[in-house]
């Protein structure tokens, strides 16, 4: 049976959701040896109904809030080993907020809060713009929100300010929330590595390009800023 007399350790990790895509809100707990003794409840600050409930080995969604209907799941196969993470389908801007992962097992009960940020972030791609009159690089990233900053850097001219020789534009995407980021860097020199860095309060992404006489090398990297 479920006693819930003692406190158990529940651990969450602050995370970010990419709107329009599926997200995961991480939560782990001290495992129990019997699935039927585990109850997982996900709650959100300011939301009346439950986000998700999993008990006696299955989802119990009778008290689920309308805004989460048909959009949540847990990794049921992993609950027995202490994984209570919530899967969230089609992340919305309004899903941002403070969530509570509340666990009851035969060993006791415990909870932990999690800050969930939502926005849009994508990997940039840097290309040589052959249509331009001078040597030009074009950095494009399809989906960002909130509006990010774009900074160019180069390996040769470290610390140089490229704002005078670059131009950045933001084009609203069809869903009227996220934006396409396009930044152009002029007067580039050969045998140099240039980096296009896009950043907002959720994510930081970098697209690198190295242009030599014989080849072009590219590399991209994306990092969520609030993930510990």
């Amino acid at each position: 049976g479920i006693s819930g007399r003692h406190s158990i350790t529940v651990t969450t990790v602050a995370s970010a959701g990419n709107i329009g895509e599926d997200g995961i809100l991480s939560c782990t707990f001290e495992p129990d040896i019997k699935l039927s003794d585990i109850v997982i409840q996900w709650l959100k600050e300011g939301v009346l109904g439950l986000v998700h409930e999993f008990k006696e080995g299955k989802d119990e969604l009778s008290e689920q809030d309308e805004m989460f209907r048909g959009r949540t799941a847990v990794f049921a196969d992993q609950v027995i080993v202490g994984n209570a993470s919530l899967r969230l389908k089609n992340v919305q801007l309004t899903d941002a907020g403070t969530y509570k992962c509340y666990i009851i097992t035969s060993k006791g009960k415990g909870n932990a809060n999690l800050e969930y940020k939502t926005g849009a972030f994508s990997m940039p791609e840097v290309n040589v713009d052959y249509n331009a009159s001078s040597e030009t690089l074009r950095c494009e990233a399809p989906r960002w929100f909130p509006q990010p900053t774009v900074v160019w850097a180069s390996q040769v001219d470290q610390g140089a300010n490229f704002s005078e020789v670059s131009n950045t534009s933001f084009e609203l995407n069809s869903e009227n929330v996220t934006m396409k980021v396009v930044s152009v860097l002029y007067n580039v020199t050969i045998n140099n590595t240039y980096s296009c860095m896009i950043e907002n309060d959720i994510a930081k992404a970098t697209g690198d390009i190295k242009v030599t006489e014989s080849e072009i090398k590219r590399r991209s990297h994306l990092q969520l800023l609030n993930s510990k």
Epitope: D22, A73, D77, I80
Partner: antibody, heavy 115, light 107 residues
Framework: QVQLQQSGAELMKPGASVKISCKAS????????MHWVKQSHGKSLEWVGY????????SYNQKFKGKATLTVDKSSSTAYMHLSSLTSEDSGVYYC????????WGQGTLVTVSA | DIVMTQSPSSMYASLGERVTITCKAS??????LSWYQQKPWKSPKTLIY???SLADGVPSRFSGSGSGQDFSLTISSLESDDTATYYC?????????FGGGTKLEIK
């Protein structure tokens, strides 16, 4: 208790295709992966693959890639396995199942491939 | 692929006897192992999940132990209803693989 109800037995000609269904009752369909398992007559069990009802993602045993296609219909809490280009080697009982945790199994669907 | 070697492949035991079936994985699968009981013309029934957890409705005479590569299913006191074929399954790494089965009959 979660019940998994499978469709009835199928007698098929070589070269034909068949689609087997597995309907889950008394639970929300998205938290468990739905696995499919084959049992040839008098033999052990073979894992075919699973479908993740949350996003439709799949994982297959290499042996069944190109032979089996796993899908789900969340609105009816039903999983499907489509078997193509049937040969006598595909004859057997196919089970849908939740493998880990509350591991329930369907009653099985007998597929017989015969000219 | 991970190979699950189950032994014995068949055995006879007396009522009330303690019976142990083993499964050895070709590599570490932690505790990602389940045990199933199958009777003729029936679908498998889960006995043990995650190596040691007893499935709901399964008599307490069944128990599972082990982790890593070596696992066992024990029936503490054999009953006539336990005549069946028993299978282990590793679900630690894709493709999931079953043992060859152990056919258990009463002496």
């Amino acid at each position: 208790q979660v019940q998994l109800q499978q469709s009835g037995a199928e007698l098929m000609k070589p070269g034909a295709s068949v689609k087997i269904s597995c309907k889950a009752s008394d639970y929300s369909f998205t938290s468990y992966y739905m696995h499919w398992v084959k049992q040839s007559h008098g033999k052990s069990l073979e894992w075919v693959g699973y479908v993740d009802p949350f996003n439709g993602g799949t994982s297959y045993n290499q042996k069944f890639k190109g032979k089996a296609t796993l899908t789900v219909d969340k609105s009816s809490s039903t999983a499907y396995m489509h078997l193509s280009s049937l040969t006598s080697e595909d004859s057997g009982v196919y089970y849908c199942a939740f493998i880990a945790g509350f591991a329930n199994w369907g009653q099985g669907t007998l597929v017989t491939v015969s000219a | 692929d991970i190979v699950m070697t189950q032994s014995p492949s068949s055995m006879y035991a007396s009522l009330g006897e303690r019976v142990t079936i083993t499964c050895k994985a070709s590599q570490d699968i932690k505790s990602y192992l389940s045990w199933y009981q199958q009777k003729p013309w029936k679908s498998p029934k889960t006995l043990i999940y995650y190596a040691t957890s007893l499935a709901d409705g399964v008599p307490s005479r069944f128990s599972g132990s082990g982790s890593g590569q070596d696992f066992s299913l024990t029936i503490s006191s054999l009953e006539s209803d336990d005549t069946a074929t028993y299978y282990c399954l590793q679900h630690g790494e894709s493709p999931y693989t079953f043992g060859g089965g152990t056919k258990l009959e009463i002496k």
